[in-house]
Each structure stands twice: as C-alpha cells, then as structure tokens.
C-alpha cells in the first residue's frame, strides 16, 4: 500500500531534502527557510536564494520550513496553574510546566493542568511524584485509598470498593451496632 500524501507532501517529495517545489513552477526547487525564519518570497529561479525573513517577536518556527507566516507563541495557561519554564524565541515555542511539588494532569494531548503532589498522609510513598504522575501512596492499616488520599475506614460505606480493604473495621462497626440492640 502506498501511503496517502497530501498535495504539499507530494510537491516536497519531488525535490531533494531541504528544498521544496516552487508553487508556480514545478521545475524549480527552492531552498527551505531555516528555523526562526519564514518564507517571504519564493526563489526566482534554480540555484537562486529563497527570500526568508526572521520571525517577529511573539512568533517562531521550530524547524526548516516554507511557511508564509511564523507560528504564534503559546501562552502558559494561568487558569491551569501553568508557569513559564522558558520564553518563546524565534526558533522555539514557549515551554510551560508546573511549580515544584506539582505534577501535570493531561486533559487532552495538548492541555494539562497542574495539581499538587499527594503527601501520603496516613500512608507511605510507594512511588514518588513525577512530572506527569502523582505520588502513588500505600495506606496504613485502617485507611483506604480514595482519589490517591488515605481515608479512614470509618468513611467506608458497604457499597464502595473499600469494603475489601476495610473488612475487619466494617465487621467491628457492625458488631458494635448489633451488640447495642437487645
């Protein structure tokens, strides 16, 4: 099976690497623009220079290209708790991340929110907090894990999954209730 190529990929594949086919004259291969620049004018003829201009402030291109415009720099999303790790430059987009002792939860491929790492109160750290994963906690006896927090078995209702972990405590509570009735 031949992979399906878009028009642009078809045009580019006719030229050697680092060059692209002139949009008005498919016998001419123009040199692509370096990262940090964009295509202002196609090369006028074979062996002649492509007119590339540097990206303006607030925009970038991260690889060689023949884009008519630079890409807008990303902004870190304050409402998601994101902070700027490194600023946007002409050849690199803004890098956003989280503060110390926080991890990223990805809502989608490109959207993440910062959350505080769990401290494992009433438990121990099984796996330390990572850039993209919360601390994994192991709970002490008499506690069960709910949303990565160790919660007292006194909060375990019969309908919940915690019943297996809290079985002795539930039995005791049930026994206490039974002994109170005559």
């Amino acid at each position: 099976l031949v992979p399906h190529l878009g028009d642009r990929e078809k045009r580019d594949s006719v030229c050697p690497q680092g060059k692209y086919i002139h949009p008005q004259n498919n016998s001419i291969c123009c040199t692509k623009c370096h990262k940090g620049t964009y295509l202002y004018n196609d090369c006028p003829g074979p062996g002649q220079d492509t007119d590339c201009r540097e990206c303006e402030s607030g925009s970038f291109t991260a690889s060689e290209n023949h884009l008519r415009h630079c890409l807008s720099c990303s902004k870190c999303r304050k409402e998601m708790g994101q902070v700027e790790i490194s600023s946007c430059t002409v050849d690199r987009d803004t890098v956003c991340g989280c503060r110390k002792n926080q991890y990223r939860h990805y809502w989608s491929e490109n959207l993440f929110q910062c959350f505080n790492c769990s401290l494992c109160l009433n438990g121990t750290v099984h796996l330390s907090c990572q850039e993209k994963q919360n601390t994994v906690c192991t709970c002490h006896a008499g506690f069960f894990l709910r949303e990565n927090e160790c919660v007292s078995c006194s909060n375990c209702k019969k309908s919940l999954e915690c019943t297996k972990l809290c079985l002795p405590q539930i039995e005791n509570v049930k026994g206490t209730e039974d002994s109170g009735t005559t």
């Epitope: 989608s108 490109n110 959207l111 959350f115 949303e147």
Partner: nanobody, 122 residues
Framework: EVQLLESGGGLVQPGGSLRLSCAAS????????MSWVRQAPGKGLEWVSW????????FYADSVKGRFTISRDNSKNTLYLQMNSLRAEDTAVYYC???????????????RGQGTLVTVSS
C-alpha cells in the same frame, strides 16, 4: 444513542444554592471526562467545570471557583454540580457535556444535553 438529561435548575435568590444533576446513558460514562458549560442570555458558551473519569481531577473557571463543586457517581451514571453563593451573573442555561479540548479555551464538545435554566434573582 447518547443521552444527557439535566435537572435541578430553577429560580433562586442571590446567595442561595442549587444542585444540578445530569443522567447519562448510551456510552461508557465511567471512562469519560465530563463537564458543565453554561450560556448566559445573549452570550456565548462558557466552561464552568469538568471532572476526570474517576473524579480525582477537577477544573473550575475562575468565575465559579470556591462556590461550585463538580462531582460524579459512576455507579449511577450521574454528574452533579453543587452551586453555592449564587450571584445574578450565574443566571444561564447549564449544559452537561462530554468535552473536547482540541480548541481550548473555546468551548467544544462531542455531545451535550438540552440544558437546565438557572435564574438567580431577588
């Protein structure tokens, strides 16, 4: 067929509370991030809140942070929105939706319910 049915809206005085519910069917509710979005009269759609499949992660718009609480009961296929300290500016039609974040911050979703009207007025 996917169905999202909101309930719990109504007229409430400023400072009052309401609890919205959304009954979901036709898809695996427990595996999906779910959200509440709203549309005030004459305005566009606005994110209110969303919650991860198991409820461990939540997001709130700045305008509702500290006043609204999103939760879910996967055993009942139901999404909730507890709204406290309601203000006149919270007046809107509230929709339960399965969000799509491709165009964030623009509101986008795979599907949403018919909505429930919340009116905050004295």
């Amino acid at each position: 067929e996917v169905q999202l049915l909101e309930s719990g809206g109504g007229l409430v005085q400023p400072g009052g509370s309401l609890r919205l519910s959304c009954a979901a069917s036709g898809f695996t509710f427990a595996k999906e991030t779910m959200s509440w979005v709203r549309q005030a009269p004459g305005k566009g759609l606005e994110w209110v809140s969303w919650i991860s499949p198991h409820g461990a992660h939540t997001f709130y718009a700045d305008s509702v942070k500290g006043r609204f609480t999103i939760s879910r009961d996967n055993s009942k296929n139901t999404l909730y929105l507890q709204m406290n300290s309601l203000r006149a500016e919270d007046t809107a039609v509230y929709y339960c939706a399965k969000p799509r974040f491709s165009y964030y911050p623009r509101v986008s979703f795979d599907y949403r319910g018919q909505g429930t009207l919340v009116t905050v007025s004295s």
